[in-house]
């Protein structure tokens, strides 16, 4: 029976040409993470494997950065970014937990960033 | 273009060891997970393990754990297989094979020639 | 582990003929989360490497004819082959891309009559 539940950051905005962390963080379970990997809707980002350690997808290795931690850090952001971001978490014996985040990119230096995460 | 180079085949005795070799070239070979594959006609397609070049880290089927060493060369693109205590069950192709990203996935998409291996006295 | 079923082992058919083969996985391969399926399909002809045939459960991969579809979701797949031409006298595999060991099925060998 899955028990855990993944908190995120929810919606987060950033300024364009700027860095934002996505961070999610799962709870409520003894499972083992084996695996977390971050996408968006039709492309994978990044793996972060508890053996084979962090891949970043080819086509994002300039702009992507592992952590802080699970999380990944996007640089040099553009207005295309803006959109939806999955944490998937797989675990044992558990199976997979996903989070959802909506990052909002700005063209103005007035973006306000959401409540910062902090991981208990 | 991308390529895989296997040796086509390894003669090897019972008990003893054998490492095979994978050179990767048309790519950045540290920016690529190398997975290694075995094929039988009694068991057909079997994954071994992969190997992350870029930081060393391995991850194996526990099948083979104990059986199987993945090691990468950077310098020299190559990624290698030791396999440990021969027997007759070790006798197999052993694939190579490259994982690209395709949209949300993880996908083998290039494939070495394979080597194939025999175990005989 | 996750275990990949394929059925039939073998089938044989005429030139031009449509053919569907199935396979089965133990878990679901689904996220729900994202709605993608992991799973793909590969075909190896003979003396030759696998190659990558469908991704996703039903992506073509670039240059692989369209005679060739993948559908179904969850556990439950199936591979077609709307036309059978000669050249695609082979074994087909399905593999659970979902999760490590990657697990793939015992394949279906396509012959023709």
């Known amino acids: 029976m899955m028990t855990g539940t993944i908190e995120t950051t929810g919606n987060i905005s950033a300024e364009k040409g700027g860095s934002i962390i996505l961070q999610c963080h799962l709870s409520s379970t003894t499972a083992q993470v084996t695996q977390v990997n971050w996408e968006q809707q039709d492309q994978l980002l990044a793996i972060c494997n508890a053996d084979l350690g962090w891949h970043i997808s080819p086509s994002f290795k300039d702009r992507v950065a592992p952590g802080p931690g699970l999380g990944l850090t996007l640089q040099s952001l553009t207005v295309n970014d803006t959109g939806e971001y999955f944490c998937i978490y797989h675990t044992y014996p558990d199976g997979t937990y996903t989070g959802r985040i909506f990052l909002e990119v700005l063209e103005s230096s007035v973006a306000e960033h959401g409540a910062r995460f902090q991981i208990p | 273009q991308v390529q895989l180079q296997q040796p086509g085949a390894e003669l090897v005795k019972p008990g003893a060891s054998v490492k095979m070799s994978c050179k990767a070239s048309g790519y950045a070979f540290t920016n690529y997970l190398m997975h290694w594959v075995k094929q039988t006609p009694g068991r057909g397609l079997e994954w071994i393990g992969a190997?992350?070049?870029?930081?060393?880290?391995?991850s194996y089927n526990q099948k083979f754990k104990g059986k199987a060493t993945l090691t990468a060369d950077k310098s020299s693109s190559t990624a290698y297989m030791q396999l440990s205590s021969l027997t007759s069950e070790d006798s197999a192709v052993y694939y190579c094979?490259?994982?690209?990203?395709?949209?949300?996935?993880?996908?083998?998409?290039?494939w070495g020639a394979g080597t194939t291996v025999t175990v005989s006295a | 582990d996750i275990v990949m079923t394929q059925s039939p082992d073998s089938l044989a058919v005429s030139l031009g003929e449509r053919v569907t083969m199935n396979c089965k996985s133990s878990?679901?391969?689904?996220?729900?989360?994202?709605?993608?399926?992991?799973l793909a399909w590969y075909q190896q002809k003979p003396g030759q490497s696998p190659k990558l045939l469908i991704y996703g459960a039903s992506t073509r991969e670039s240059g692989v004819p369209d005679r060739f579809s993948g559908s179904g979701s969850g556990t439950d797949f199936t591979l077609t082959i709307s036309s059978v031409q000669a050249e695609d006298v082979a074994v087909y595999y399905c593999q659970n891309d979902h999760r490590y060991p990657f697990t793939f099925g015992g394949g279906t060998k396509l012959e023709i009559k």
């Open positions: 878990q679901s391969l689904l996220n729900s989360g994202i709605q993608k399926n992991y």
């Open positions: 094979a490259r994982t690209g990203v395709y949209g949300n996935f993880l996908i083998f998409d290039y």
């Open positions: 190997i992350n070049p870029g930081s060393g880290g391995t």
